[in-house]
Interface confidence: medium
């Protein structure tokens, strides 16, 4: 991260401050999309009253974007031409290439629970028969 971005008010992992992690993350699961197209990556945290202080979107070990409670959205410079914030706390990937195939993680940093992580696997297909996985919007 050779640039200034909002602070990640969270840690990662399980539980915090002596609290029990009651929340669950619902994701779009395994999805596929066509090369050149776009896809929405979406996660939703439920069943917890913990304060969400930041959501990080990562591809393997690369930061794609963050949405910080204090500072709003920041898209990583290396992805700014192909990544759009939203809808909600989700992320839209555009101009997909086969190299975009892989695991994506939404990381919800919360207090006092700690960090909740959701996993999405995206397959970018050459053919035009790609079937998009189920999608949902954050209310």
């Amino acid at each position: 991260y050779p640039y200034d971005v909002p602070d990640y008010a969270g840690g990662g992992g399980s539980g915090g401050g002596g609290s029990m992690m009651t929340g669950t993350i619902e994701t779009t699961g395994n999805i596929s999309a066509e090369k050149g197209g776009s896809i929405i990556l979406q996660c939703h945290l439920s069943s917890t009253t913990a304060q969400v202080t930041q959501v990080n979107w990562e591809q393997q070990d690369q930061a794609l974007a963050i949405c910080n409670a204090d500072l709003g959205w920041h898209i990583s410079p290396s992805f700014k031409d192909r990544v759009a914030p939203g809808p909600g706390l989700g992320l839209t990937l555009q101009s997909l290439t086969v190299n975009d195939t892989g695991e994506y993680f939404c990381i919800y940093h919360t207090y006092p629970d700690g960090t909740y992580t959701g996993r999405i696997f995206l397959e970018v297909l050459e053919s035009s028969v790609a079937e998009h996985g189920a999608r949902f919007q954050i209310p």
Epitope: Y1, P6, D7, G12, G13, G17, T53, N68
Partner: antibody
Framework: EVQLVESGGGLVQPGGSLRLSCAAS????????MHWVRQAPGKGLEWVAF????????YYADTVKGRFTISRDNAKNSLYLQMNSLRAEDTAVYYC????????????WGQGTMVTVSS | DIQMTQSPSSLSASVGDRVTITCRAS??????LAWYQQKPGKAPKLLIY???TLQSGVPSRFSGSGSGTDFTLTISSLQPEDFATYYC?????????FGGGTKVEIK
């Protein structure tokens, strides 16, 4: 170059108060969460308090909760720790530290300021 | 709170030695562990975060591994400037806690 410079330490009697300051330079202070960490003489490190970039998230160690207050002034690139009802066990070097961009690890630290609580 | 236990508390080694320090968490912290180096009278310096990611500017002879509860810091070939005290810190959850430290001394 990132620089963090603490000040405000000194000798104070038990029950007294002290206000520590941390002057930040070399980075966009308003974009980073900040920590205070202390180290008693000859002992290990103890996390004290955290404040997020816009002050919306503030957390304290149980040992200082209700006595210490962390705050920041982004316009002045400054971090503060107001310490009240000081006890002998608060004697330590107090460091301000910048939170890494992505996790609660601390990537830059000041040189520390010594706080001695003694009668 | 999560307790972090480091071992050994001190060790003696020679320049060129391979040194291993371990850190154990009282419960799972996923991969979220940092390692710091501190020299006498100086502030700590971040070496490793998220278990195995090397902080920018830190020599590659330092490496971290582990997940869950057991973690290791390895110095592949000890250099004169590496004699210091090393601390682990869990950055998994509030409150963030440190290990007691491991002092690496010259044999």
């Amino acid at each position: 170059e990132v620089q963090l410079v603490e000040s405000g330490g000194g000798l104070v009697q038990p029950g007294g108060s002290l206000r520590l300051s941390c002057a930040a330079s070399g980075f966009t202070f308003s974009n980073f969460g900040m920590h205070w960490v202390r180290q008693a003489p000859g002992k290990g490190l103890e996390w004290v308090a955290f404040i997020s970039s816009g002050s919306s998230s503030i957390y304290y160690a149980d040992t200082v909760k209700g006595r210490f207050t962390i705050s920041r002034d982004n316009a002045k690139n400054s971090l503060y720790l107001q310490m009240n009802s000081l006890r002998a066990e608060d004697t330590a070097v107090y460091y301000c530290a910048r939170m890494r961009l992505d996790y609660y690890a601390m990537d830059y630290w000041g040189q520390g300021t010594m706080v001695t609580v003694s009668s | 709170d999560i307790q972090m236990t480091q071992s050994p508390s001190s060790l003696s080694a020679s320049v060129g030695d391979r040194v291993t320090i371990t850190c154990r968490a009282s419960k799972s912290i996923s991969k979220y562990l940092a390692w710091y180096q501190q020299k006498p009278g100086k502030a700590p310096k971040l070496l490793i975060y998220s278990g195995s990611t090397l902080q920018s500017g830190v020599p590659s002879r330092f490496s971290g591994s582990g997940s869950g509860t057991d973690f290791t810091l390895t110095i592949s070939s000890l250099q004169p400037e590496d004699f210091a005290t090393y601390y682990c810190q869990q950055h998994n959850e509030y409150p963030w806690t440190f290990g007691g430290g491991t002092k690496v001394e010259i044999k």
